[in-house]
């Protein structure tokens, strides 16, 4: 998947663009909005009818090196009595994000953009049964 | 990717931190993931805390299209298909990294940007604050 070029109908490439070798792009990894914080309701992972746990994955050759993944605790959903109800299903909600991967080749290093699918949390759904004979 | 020679004395002198600016290949790994949540699953309709998906488009950003979830109800859908206000539908938010064209309009120069997206909704027991 290549990054699309700027559409000519929208705007022309300015003269101020930095020179970039063919087949590559310049990427500044000083993050815009670095200090922005998620303002989700408190403890929703425990209060949800489809609760989840978090696992931190760490990779020194990835930027950011820390990626948090959620895992649904149950197959079913938690009912009003606090019991797992298997007539409903807990399912993961996923979102893509970008990371920069550092690759070592001998004494050289290269950088590659990578799409990572992050499981963000879980939701409770009515199951679908496909009748396949 | 684009190869950058390491410092003399490699591998011991390798910098553990990422440099501020890197040259990266235009090809993105794991391109086979589906970017349209409506096509990848119908959880948004089948959930007890259903949500609508809104398209957010910005040509100065990669990916240029991001889908934002908005919970349909304040409450959750019960077994009878009615909205139960004893429970709450709340958005699940996630910080993601995108590419922002910098300087603006440049085709091959970007900066990482952190944005907050609502990915879907989940049904939670509300927190009731007892005020004396």
């Amino acid at each position: 998947r290549k990054i699309p070029k700027v559409g000519h109908t929208f705007f022309q490439k300015p003269e101020s663009c930095p020179p970039v070798p063919g087949g590559s792009m310049k990427l500044d990894i000083g993050i815009i909005n670095e200090n922005q914080r998620v303002s989700m309701s408190r403890n929703i992972e425990s209060r949800s009818t489809s609760p989840w746990n978090y696992t931190v994955t760490w990779d020194p050759n990835r930027y950011p090196s820390e990626v948090v993944q959620a895992q649904c605790r149950n197959l079913g959903c938690i009912n009003a009595q606090g019991k797992e109800d298997i007539s409903m299903n807990s399912v993961p909600i996923q979102q893509e994000t970008l990371v920069v991967r550092r690759k070592h080749q001998g004494c050289s290093v290269s950088f590659q953009l990578e799409k990572v699918l992050v499981t963000v949390g879980c939701t409770c759904v009515t199951p679908v049964i496909h009748h396949v004979q | 990717g684009i190869t950058i020679p390491r410092n003399p004395g490699c591998p011991n002198s390798e910098d553990k931190n990422f440099p501020r600016t890197v040259m990266v290949n235009l090809n993105i790994h794991n391109r086979n993931t589906n970017t349209n949540p409506k096509r990848s699953s119908d959880y948004y309709n089948r959930s007890t805390s259903p949500w609508n998906l809104h398209r957010n488009e910005d040509p100065e950003r990669y990916p240029s299209v991001i889908w934002e979830a908005k919970c349909r109800h304040l409450g959750c859908i019960n077994a009878d298909g009615n909205v139960d206000y004893h429970m709450n539908s709340v958005p699940i938010q996630q910080e993601i990294l995108v590419l922002r064209r910098e300087p603006p309009h440049c085709p091959n120069s970007f900066r990482l940007e952190k944005i907050l997206v609502s990915v879907g909704c989940t049904c939670v027991t509300p927190i009731v604050h007892h005020v004396a």
Partner: nanobody, 118 residues
């Protein structure tokens, strides 16, 4: 294509036991989850037991909790439902189902009839 074949049903007296088996032919079970549901004439379909493959998490319907046990034998590519202290209300056709992804279930075969007499 994977076909699920249920067996082990039959007629049993109240208080008795049965062990249902579900075999996967033409492939292996889905990597996500496997479960059993039942359908009695004129009644709604009811999931009775489910098992998640990644961590062997199991869960049961309230109506069978403590009496039924779902288990698997990976080597034999078989999932079992051990049913004990059976009641007349457990009478139904029992189907084995496999989850290809969370929230979605597929089943094959005709199921197996369980009849509990009083």
């Amino acid at each position: 294509e994977v076909q699920l074949v249920e067996s082990g049903g039959g007629l049993v007296q109240a208080g008795g036991s049965l062990r249902l088996s579900c075999g996967a032919s033409g492939g292996t079970f889905s990597s996500y989850a496997t479960g059993w549901f039942r359908q009695a004439p004129g009644k709604e379909r009811e999931f009775v037991a489910v098992l998640r493959w990644s961590d062997s998490h199991t869960a049961y319907a309230d109506s069978v909790e403590g009496r039924f046990t779902i288990s698997r034998d990976g080597a034999k590519n078989t999932v079992y439902l051990q049913m004990s202290s059976l009641k007349p209300e457990d009478t139904a056709i029992y189907y084995c189902t496999t989850g290809t992804r969370p929230g979605e279930w597929h089943y094959w075969g005709q199921g197996t009839q369980v009849t509990v007499s009083s």
